[in-house]
C-alpha cells in the first residue's frame, strides 16, 4: 500500500514509509487540541487488495472551553454554536447595562488544554452624574445625585426679570442615555426677541404678534404692482433675527428688459438681487439697482 | 435712559432748505432706530421716516423725494433735510427713538418748529 | 395709505364719566394698534400699545380693545389730568399712521 490517508483530528504515530506490505497495520492518535472518545477504531491495515481498510478521524473531538454562564443583566452567545476551541463567545448587555471587560473571548489552545483568551466581563448599570445647571433656569430633580438610564430631566426658564420672557432654546428634555451621557446638550434660557418686521409696499399676512419671542412664525405679501423678492415667510431665531431675513417687496418693472410677474406676491426675481439687509432698513428706492425697477 | 432733542427749526422761505438736528445724550443714536414725526394744526401727526440702527431708512413715500434722513454717529446726531419746503410743511417736527425695535413712540421731546412763509 | 377715523372729534365729560373713544381703520391692521394722549401744551405721549397693552406708568383706568378694523379706547372714570386729545396709530403698513385726533374736555 501507498501512505496511509490523513485526517483534521488524527495523526499517524510515527513515521510514515513511502510503502507498506499487505497486512501491514499502522496507527493513529488525536492530533493537539483534540481527545479521543471509544469506540472507534484509530488504526488501519493494508489490505490484500493494496488499500487501506476503511478508517475515519469522528473519534476524535476537539478540546472544549469550559462553559461560560451569561453574564448578570447580559447575554453570552456562540458565534458558532460550540465551545471547541477556535470557537468565539460575544458578550452584550441588556438595555440600561453597559459592558466592563472584552466583548468577545476566543477559545483557544494552552499546550493541549483548551482555554478562554481572558476573563467574562460584567455588565454594570448604566449612571449618569446629575446634568447641568443653567444660567436663568432649572431643571427637574436638581436634588438626585445619581441618575439611572433613561431617567429624564425637564428644563424650565426662570421669570425674566425684565418685560420679555426667557425662551428655552434647545431641548427641554434630556435623559440618561448609553455611555452614561445625557442624550442631549442641556438647554440655554436667554431672551430672545425680534424687530418689528417692517417690509416697505407689503404688509405681514399671519403671525401678528405684540412682541417676537423664539421661533414666531411671520408671513407677508407684496401690494398690487409689486413681487416679494426673499422669502414670505420667516422665523425669529435664537440670535434674535429673523431667518430667512426680512424679504422686500420690489416694483414690478414694465420696461421691455424685465419680464413682469403675473403675480403681486411672487415672482421671477431680478437678473441680480439686491442685498436684503439683516432688518429691515432698505436701500432707499432712489439708490442704486432700484432706479431701473421704478422706471 | 437716552435723551433725544431736537434743533434747527425756523423760519424758511417756499422753496428753501433746512436740516433739522436730533442729539442724543445718555446714549448712542447709532443704537437706537429714530423716526421723525411732524404735527401741524391742519394735519395732525404724520410720521416722515425712520433711519434704523443698521442705517437703512424707510420714508412716507409722501415726502421720500424732499426729505432725507441720515446719521452721524461721530457726532451722535441723527438728521432730517428738508429741501423743496412749502408752505403746509409748517408744523412741530419730533424725533422719536422707535420703542426697542417695535413702532410705538414713547420717548417723544420737545420738537423743534418749522415755520415756512415768504 | 391706511386711513384712521377717530369719532368723536371732540367730547365733554364731567370727573368720574366713562369715556370711549373709537378709531375705524380704512383696512384690516390685526391689532397693530397704538394710543397716545397729547396733554395741552405738552408732546403726545404713548398709553396703550398693541390694541391693549398699557405702557408703564398708565393708569389701569385706560383701556383698550379691538381688532381688524375697529378699536376701543376706554377711561373707565375719568380725571381732570386726563385732558388733551387722543390719538391712535397703526403699524401694520408703512407709511404709520395716525388718526385725526379725539379732544377730550372736563365739564
Known amino acids: 500500500c501507498e501512505a496511509p490517508p490523513t485526517f483534521e483530528a488524527m495523526e499517524l504515530i510515527g513515521k510514515p514509509k513511502p510503502y507498506y506490505r499487505v497486512g501491514e497495520r499502522v496507527d493513529y492518535k488525536c492530533k493537539k487540541g483534540y481527545f479521543y472518545i471509544p469506540p472507534l477504531a484509530t488504526h488501519t491495515i493494508c489490505d490484500r487488495n493494496h488499500t487501506w481498510l476503511p478508517v475515519s478521524d469522528e473519534g476524535c473531538y476537539r478540546e472544549m472551553c469550559p462553559h461560560i454562564r451569561d453574564p448578570l443583566n447580559g447575554e453570552a452567545i456562540l458565534a458558532n454554536g460550540s465551545y471547541e476551541f477556535g470557537a468565539e463567545l460575544h458578550f452584550i448587555c441588556n438595555e440600561g447595562y453597559y459592558l466592563i471587560g472584552k466583548d468577545i473571548l476566543y477559545c483557544e489552545l494552552k499546550d493541549t488544554v483548551a482555554i478562554w483568551s481572558g476573563k467574562p466581563p460584567l455588565c454594570e448599570k448604566i449612571l449618569c452624574t446629575p446634568p447641568p445647571k443653567i444660567k436663568n433656569g432649572k431643571h427637574t430633580f436638581s436634588e438626585v445625585e445619581v441618575f439611572e438610564y433613561l431617567d429624564a430631566v425637564t428644563y424650565s426658564c426662570d421669570p425674566a426679570p425684565g418685560p420679555d420672557p426667557f425662551s428655552l432654546i434647545g431641548e427641554s428634555m434630556i435623559y440618561c442615555g448609553n455611555n452614561s451621557t445625557w442624550s442631549h446638550a442641556a438647554p440655554e434660557c436667554k431672551v430672545v426677541k425680534c424687530r418689528f418686521p417692517v417690509v416697505e409696499n407689503g404688509k405681514q399676512i399671519s403671525g401678528f404678534g405684540k412682541k417676537f419671542y423664539y421661533k414666531a412664525t411671520v408671513m407677508f405679501e407684496c401690494d398690487k404692482g409689486y413681487y416679494l423678492n426673499g422669502s414670505d415667510k420667516i422665523v425669529c431665531e435664537s440670535n434674535s433675527t429673523w431667518d430667512p431675513p426680512v424679504p422686500k417687496c420690489l416694483k414690478v418693472s414694465t420696461s421691455p428688459t424685465t419680464k413682469s410677474p403675473t403675480s403681486s406676491a411672487s415672482g421671477p426675481r431680478p437678473t441680480y438681487k439686491p442685498p436684503v439687509s439683516n432688518y429691515p432698513g432698505y436701500p432707499k428706492p432712489d439708490e442704486g439697482i432700484l432706479n431701473n425697477l421704478d422706471d | 435712559e437716552v435723551q433725544l432733542v431736537e434743533s434747527g427749526g425756523g423760519l424758511v422761505q417756499p422753496g428753501g432748505s433746512l436740516r433739522l438736528s436730533c442729539a442724543a445724550s445718555g446714549g448712542s443714536v447709532s443704537s437706537y432706530d429714530i423716526s421723525w414725526i411732524r404735527q401741524s394744526p391742519s394735519r395732525g401727526l404724520e410720521w416722515l421716516g425712520v433711519i434704523w440702527t443698521d442705517g437703512g431708512t424707510n420714508y412716507n413715500s409722501a415726502f421720500m423725494s424732499r426729505f432725507t434722513i441720515s446719521r452721524d454717529d461721530s457726532k451722535n446726531t441723527a438728521y432730517l433735510q428738508m429741501n423743496s419746503l412749502k408752505t403746509e410743511d409748517t408744523a412741530v417736527y419730533y424725533c422719536?427713538?422707535?420703542?426697542?425695535?417695535?413702532?410705538?413712540?414713547?420717548?417723544w421731546g420737545q420738537g423743534t418748529l418749522v415755520t415756512v412763509s415768504s | 395709505a391706511i386711513q384712521l377715523t377717530q369719532s368723536p372729534s371732540s367730547l365733554s365729560a364731567s370727573v368720574g364719566d366713562r369715556v370711549t373713544i373709537t378709531c375705524r381703520a380704512s383696512?384690516?391692521?390685526?391689532?397693530?394698534l397704538n394710543w397716545y394722549l397729547q396733554k395741552p401744551g405738552q408732546s403726545p405721549q404713548l398709553l396703550i400699545y398693541?390694541?391693549?397693552s398699557l405702557h408703564s406708568g398708565v393708569p389701569d383706568r385706560f383701556s383698550g380693545s379691538g381688532s381688524g378694523t375697529d378699536f376701543t379706547l376706554k377711561i373707565s372714570r375719568v380725571e381732570a389730568e386726563d385732558v388733551g386729545v387722543y390719538y391712535c396709530q397703526q403699524y401694520i403698513k408703512l407709511p404709520w399712521t395716525f388718526g385725526q385726533g379725539t379732544k377730550v374736555e372736563i365739564k
Open positions: 422719536e427713538r422707535v420703542y426697542d425695535g417695535y413702532p410705538w413712540f414713547a420717548y
Open positions: 398693541y390694541t391693549s
Open positions: 383696512q384690516g391692521i390685526a391689532n397693530y
